[in-house]
Interface confidence: medium
């Protein structure tokens, strides 16, 4: 990250400040895309009243962007041609590429739990048959 | 260059109070999480107080709570640790650390402050 | 509160060693543990942070392993400014907790 963004207010993993960690992370889960098009990538953290501090969205080691509490969103400037914030607390991918397959990854910070990781698998196909996965908005 | 800077530091009475400042340059001040931690004499770190980049988020040691306000002023790039009410256990070096954009580890550490409380 | 636990305390090695130096969390904190170096007198460094990710600067030598509650730090190739006091710190979870520190002195 050679470039000043929003603080991250989390740390990752499982539960903080004693507490028990009772929310759940839905996600689109395994999605498929044609090369060139567009994909939303969406997570939504329910069964908690934990307060959201920020959202980071990550493939593989890699930021694409965060959502800060604070802040707003940030593009990571290696994605910004590409990556579209929302909607809600979501990405958009665009011009999809045969090298966007992989894994992505939603990272809610939250205090006092800790962090909730959701995982979504995305596989761009170069056929016209891709079949998109289910999709849903945050409220 | 990052630079954070400690001051305020000095001998105080039980009981008494404190506010240590740290000034920052260099870097972005108001896009960053930014925490306090302590050191006793010969003894090993320990976490004080986090305040998030725009104060909408601010965490405490259990040892603090009640007692230590973290604040800070963004137009000036400046972080504040107010320590009241303070007692002989409160002895240490108090850094000031930037959080690392990503995480709650702290990636630049001022060179800090001494506190004694101690009648 | 999550306890760490760091093993050695303390460890005398020469220059050119390989020195590992291991820390346990009291539960799972996934990956997120970092490593900090402190030489006397002075503010803590960071080495390592998300178990294993290399910060910016920090020699290659140093390398950070393990996820769940057993996590070490290795410098494979002891140089004399590495001679200097390691902390572990889990960035899991509200509060952030260091372990004890491991001192590696000149044999």
């Known amino acids: 990250y050679p470039y000043d963004v929003p603080d991250y207010a989390g740390g990752g993993g499982s539960g903080g400040g004693g507490s028990m960690m009772t929310g759940t992370i839905e996600t689109t889960g395994n999605i498929s895309a044609e090369k060139g098009g567009s994909i939303i990538l969406q997570c939504h953290l329910s069964s908690t009243t934990a307060q959201v501090t920020q959202v980071n969205w990550e493939q593989q080691d890699q930021a694409l962007a965060i959502c800060n509490a604070d802040l707003g969103w940030h593009i990571s400037p290696s994605f910004k041609d590409r990556v579209a914030p929302g909607p809600g607390l979501g990405l958009t991918l665009q011009s999809l590429t045969v090298n966007d397959t992989g894994e992505y990854f939603c990272i809610y910070h939250t205090y006092p739990d800790g962090t909730y990781t959701g995982r979504i698998f995305l596989e761009v196909l170069e056929s016209s048959v891709a079949e998109h996965g289910a999709r849903f908005q945050i409220p | 260059e990052v630079q954070l800077v400690e001051s305020g530091g000095g001998l105080v009475q039980p009981g008494g109070s404190l506010r240590l400042s740290c000034a920052a340059s260099g870097f972005t001040f108001s896009n960053f999480g930014m925490h306090w931690v302590r050191q006793a004499p010969g003894k090993g770190l320990e976490w004080v107080a986090f305040i998030s980049s725009g104060s909408s988020s601010i965490y405490y040691a259990d040892t603090v709570k009640g007692r230590f306000t973290i604040s800070r002023d963004n137009a000036k790039n400046s972080l504040y640790l107010q320590m009241n009410s303070l007692r002989a256990e409160d002895t240490a070096v108090y850094y000031c650390a930037r959080m690392r954009l990503d995480y709650y580890a702290m990636d630049y550490w001022g060179q800090g402050t001494m506190v004694t409380v101690s009648s | 509160d999550i306890q760490m636990t760091q093993s050695p305390s303390s460890l005398s090695a020469s220059v050119g060693d390989r020195v590992t130096i291991t820390c346990r969390a009291s539960k799972s904190i996934s990956k997120y543990l970092a490593w900090y170096q402190q030489k006397p007198g002075k503010a803590p460094k960071l080495l390592i942070y998300?178990?294993?990710t290399l910060q910016s600067g920090v020699p290659s030598r140093f390398s950070g392993s393990g996820s769940g509650t057993d996590f070490t730090l290795t410098i494979s190739s002891l140089q004399p400014e590495d001679f200097a006091t390691y902390y572990c710190q889990q960035h899991n979870e509200y509060p952030w907790t260091f372990g004890g520190g491991t001192k590696v002195e000149i044999k």
């Open positions: 998300s178990g294993s």
